[in-house]
């Protein structure tokens, strides 16, 4: 059928609560494309009727809620004018008690389930809630060992739990809970997080190391498409954010309307002592305004930039 197959990492999810997955694969989904979701190689697309428990919502597949029998491989097919990509996502559903955060023994747990706080620092935990715009999320409550978290050291800020002056006693099993509203119905979302405490700050020192770029310029023709990787090494237990910024603004926010320049999905390769992270920036079409502007890759406190430059004229 001419579609290129792309395999995503496994997602491990809780039964009896909402779940959503967005079919984005920059730069494929940046232009004019159609996205269709299928389950287990079925020829019949996932329903787009919003009353259906499982339905497609724009580029998302939405489960309201996820059920035990929903485990399997889902495909989203992205069709552009001249291309077709089929993204395969393996979803594994498991039963989980309301306050149960220790889900050891499950393979390839995402970092959303395992987070790090840094001893003696002000730090934070993140409640990862990825849902389409049609889902409205209420305020988040945080629990530790099944009990609500309280105290002047803890502050809930949007999707984060801020912890001031982290102590060794802050390790343990946490859960964040939110009420999701969709089409007038309410659902509870509960994410478990196993938290460990570290004194170490970074790979080979106190900061993440940006391998590429190296504060340099790149020659690129006007109107072309350009993809630049930012490669970062960091400790396995780091909590650093990696992103691309321009004019001190996230590129996805800066180019929110045109979506001409986008940040890619972060990937990483695990080594024994550290992780190698890659997050790219895609210029769908380089414009004059892009030249001379530093596009910054950030990784924790580390930064490195690229500057686009017009190629020197060829007088041959």
């Amino acid at each position: 059928d001419g579609c290129k197959d792309i395999f995503m990492k496994n997602e491990i999810l809780s039964a009896s609560q909402p779940f959503a997955f967005n079919c984005t694969f920059p730069p494929i989904t940046s232009g004019e494309v159609s996205v269709t979701w299928y389950k287990n190689s079925s020829k019949i697309p996932v329903s787009k009727i919003i009353q259906s428990r499982i339905h497609q919502d724009e580029t998302w597949i939405l489960f309201l809620p996820m059920e035990w029998g929903d485990s399997g491989v889902y495909q989203c097919v992205i069709k552009g004018r001249d291309s077709c990509h089929r993204i395969h996502v393996n979803l594994t559903v498991f039963e989980k008690h309301w306050c149960d955060t220790s889900i050891g023994g499950l393979p390839n747990l995402s970092d959303e389930y395992k987070q790090i706080l840094h001893l003696g620092k002000d730090d934070s935990l993140t409640c990862h809630l990825h849902f389409p715009k049609s889902c409205v999320l209420g305020p988040i409550k945080w629990y530790k060992d099944c009990n609500e978290i309280k105290g002047e050291r803890f502050t809930v800020l949007e999707t984060r739990l801020l912890v001031s002056n982290v102590s060794a006693e802050d390790r343990g099993n946490y859960a964040c809970q939110a009420i999701l509203t969709h089409s007038g119905k309410q659902y509870e979302v509960l994410n478990g997080i196993t938290v460990s405490i570290t004194e170490r700050a970074g790979y080979g020192g106190s900061v993440p190391k940006i391998i590429y770029p190296k504060n340099h310029s790149i020659e690129v023709q006007l109107g072309t498409t350009l993809i630049v990787d930012c490669n970062v090494t960091d400790t396995k237990d780091n909590t650093n954010l990696r992103c691309w910024r321009v004019n001190n603004t996230l590129v996805d926010d800066y180019y929110d309307e045109s979506k001409r320049i986008r940040e890619g999905v972060e990937t990483h390769v695990s080594f024994r002592e550290h992780n190698l992270y890659t997050v790219n920036i895609t210029f769908l079409e380089v414009k004059m305004e892009d030249y001379g502007l530093p596009f910054m890759c950030h990784a924790g406190v580390s930064t490195a930039y690229i500057i686009l430059q017009l190629p020197a004229p060829d007088f041959r």
Epitope: W98, D100, T101, D145, G151, G172, N173
Partner: antibody, heavy 116, light 107 residues
Framework: QVQLVQSGAEVKKPGASVKVSCKVS????????MNWVNQAPGQGLEWMGM????????RLAQKFKGRVTMTVDKSTSTVYMELSSLRSEDTAVYYC?????????WGQGTLVTVSS | DIQMTQSPSSLSASVGDRVTITCRAS??????LNWYQQKPGKAPKRLIY???SLDPGVPSRFSGSRSGTDFTLTISSLQPEDFATYYC?????????FGQGTKVEIK
């Protein structure tokens, strides 16, 4: 390091009250729940209830509602458990146990003897 | 309330033996279960947190596992200092409840 130091042994008459203290050091006192557990001689462990030092929210086991009062003194990082209308079957060792992570640290215990 | 049924109530074993103690929860408690060791005249000491996480300083011969609502504490090779009483505790929802205890004695 973390320490929970309880008050000394008490001998009380039936009908009287006893107030046991638990002084905390080594962690942020107002960040975590504190539990109280008792153990009658030769018997098992029994959860009585818990209090959060931040706002004094208390949760009690049904058996102890009306007879147990838990309080907090933030200035001294101390939690108190008062048991009233004592009877002979209240003779037990009373422990405080912190929920920094669930029931991680325990006091050394306070023996309360109820005898006429 | 959640009931915790612990078995056996006592057992006799020799140094080097493999010992297994079980707690059954009357309803789903996820992994919210601890194991404690108590010696006469002393406060309980936590061995295992959240079903299977070994507390710092606890010998690796102690391990915890779960199958549904059945929880197991295993001592792979009993040592002289392990003769004591062991309790499980569920903290999934209050009122929190302990198992009745298992006394491990020298054969």
């Amino acid at each position: 390091q973390v320490q929970l130091v309880q008050s000394g042994a008490e001998v009380k008459k039936p009908g009287a009250s006893v107030k046991v203290s638990c002084k905390v050091s080594g962690y942020f006192f107002t960040s975590y729940w504190m539990n109280w557990v008792n153990q009658a001689p030769g018997q098992g462990l029994e959860w009585m209830g818990m209090i959060h030092p931040y706002d004094s929210e208390t949760r009690l086991a049904q058996k102890f509602k009306g007879r147990v009062t838990m309080t907090v003194d933030k200035s001294t990082s101390t939690v108190y458990m008062e048991l009233s209308s004592l009877r002979s079957e209240d003779t037990a060792v009373y422990y405080c146990a912190s929920s920094t992570t669930a029931f991680a640290y325990w006091g050394q215990g306070t023996l309360v003897t109820v005898s006429s | 309330d959640i009931q915790m049924t612990q078995s056996p109530s006592s057992l006799s074993a020799s140094v080097g033996d493999r010992v297994t103690i079980t707690c059954r929860a009357s309803q789903d408690i996820g992994n919210a279960l601890n194991w404690y060791q108590q010696k006469p005249g002393k406060a309980p000491k936590r061995l295992i947190y959240a079903t299977s996480s070994l507390d710092p300083g606890v010998p690796s011969r102690f391990s915890g596992s779960r199958s549904g609502t059945d929880f197991t504490l295993t001592i792979s090779s009993l040592q002289p200092e392990d003769f004591a009483t062991y309790y499980c505790l569920q903290y999934a929802s209050s009122p929190y409840t302990f198992g009745q205890g298992t006394k491990v004695e020298i054969k």
